[in-house]
């Protein structure tokens, strides 16, 4: 057991590493190092991560577990998967809401908030792409509605009133004057 920086551990099996005096077997995921082994190729003393903490990987050096993240209620986040000893809480958005990243280069660990999905039905439009990773993509107007400006307007129910060309094409009415 020399004092060099990265000595080879002549231990049966793998996952042994020099921790101070001895080459020790590390701790499994979900456990932290209470004390290194006290003889060559021995087992370290490992304890299960306390509640609300975790360690996702096997390790030789973590003497404490990482605190589980809390989902940001202010950003309308919810826990999709609760924290366990081996995995952090997975935060996301509840059904009907989508992730809006708070930074331009968005990665899985980027801060985000949840936005309510567009309800295409309430806008009298077809749903082209369901809302999940991004907002709902709405399509053309539903039957009985026609494009007018940015919205869908209901077809007239009688021959009274105007029915512009687009209305007439969709609703089957002609302008009656």
């Amino acid at each position: 057991q020399g004092g060099t920086r990265s000595p080879r551990c002549d231990c049966a099996g793998d996952f042994h590493k020099k921790i101070g005096l001895f080459c020790c077997r590390g701790c499994p995921a979900g456990h932290y190092l209470k004390a290194p082994c006290t003889e060559p190729c021995g087992n370290s003393t490992c304890l299960v991560c306390p509640q609300d903490t975790f360690l996702a990987w096997e390790n030789h050096h973590n003497s404490e577990c990482a605190r589980c993240q809390a989902c940001d209620e202010q950003a309308s986040q919810v826990a999709l998967e609760n924290c366990s000893a081996v995995a952090d809480t997975r935060c996301g958005c509840k059904p009907g809401w989508f992730v809006e990243c708070q930074v331009s280069q968005c990665v899985s660990s980027s801060p985000f908030y949840c936005q309510p999905c567009l309800d295409c039905g309430a806008l009298h439009r077809h749903t082209r792409l369901l809302c999940s990773r991004r907002d709902t993509d709405c399509g053309t107007c539903l039957p009985g509605f026609y494009e007018h400006g940015d919205g869908c307007v209901s077809c007239p129910t009688s021959t009274l009133g105007s029915c512009p060309e687009r209305c007439a094409a969709v609703c089957g009415w002609r302008q009656m004057f």
């Epitope: 057991q1 101070g20 005096l21 209470k34 006290t38 003889e39 003497s63």
Partner: antibody, heavy 121, light 107 residues
């Protein structure tokens, strides 16, 4: 209360033998490594020997290798140091020490009061 | 063997002073370093482990730092009970070795 108490020291002639004992109490002795550390009069600390909790591993300072033997009896909560072929330079207070509270193997957070070994003709 | 060199070998100080003791290892020992305090006729007392962690019950005026080969023990605001000899010890490899000691006495 966690306690280590050494005994067995005394005056011995060069070439003679002595057996030191260390009685442990207040902690689960069989769970912890133990060591002997000595201090010559007016001098600094010198590590002598190490034994793992199960006795499966021992280590010695070069100055005592082949002359001293460390052992333990977990059933009796006792640590021993058999010292043979004693020399004048082995004269020292001998401490038994362990670590029951710290995640640093090879450090010593509990010490006995020491027992004096004098090697002189 | 890893040689541990302490400096100074002695230091005279007054109550309230800040005292700094250094310990140098002859080779890289990561943070596997402990500090002890010893008073005449007594067994050593454990102060600091893994270079910078204070043992429970040790006053916060004691602090340790360092990594690799160079380490420091600092006593900030020396108290009358702190006059003693201090030792560093490496636990990176056998044989375990101690520094020669630093005696802190009254100026």
């Amino acid at each position: 209360e966690v306690q280590l108490v050494e005994s067995g020291g005394g005056l011995v002639k060069p070439g003679g033998s002595l057996r030191l004992s260390c009685a442990a109490s207040g902690f689960t002795f069989s769970d912890y490594y133990m060591s002997w550390i000595r201090q010559a009069p007016g001098k600094g600390l010198e590590w002598v020997s190490y034994i793992s909790s199960s006795s499966s591993y021992t280590n010695y300072a070069d100055s005592v290798k082949g002359r001293f033997t460390i052992s333990r009896d977990n059933a009796k909560n006792s640590l021993y140091l058999q010292m043979n072929s004693l020399r004048a330079e082995d004269t020292a207070v001998y401490y038994c020490a362990s670590n029951v509270d710290t995640a640093m193997v090879g450090a010593f957070d509990i010490w006995g009061q020491g027992t004096l070994v004098t090697v002189s003709s | 063997d890893i040689e541990m060199t302490q400096s100074p070998s002695s230091v005279s100080a007054s109550v309230g002073d800040t005292v700094t003791i250094t310990c140098r290892a002859s080779q890289h020992i990561s943070n596997w370093l402990a500090w002890y305090q010893q008073k005449p006729g007594q067994a050593p007392k454990f102060l600091i482990y893994t270079a910078s962690n204070l043992q429970s019950g040790v006053p916060s005026r004691f602090s340790g730092s360092g990594y690799g080969t160079d380490f420091t023990l600092t006593i900030s605001g020396l108290q009358p009970e702190d006059f003693a000899t201090y030792y560093c010890q490496q636990a990176d490899s056998f044989p375990l070795t101690f520094g020669g000691g630093t005696k802190v006495d009254i100026k």
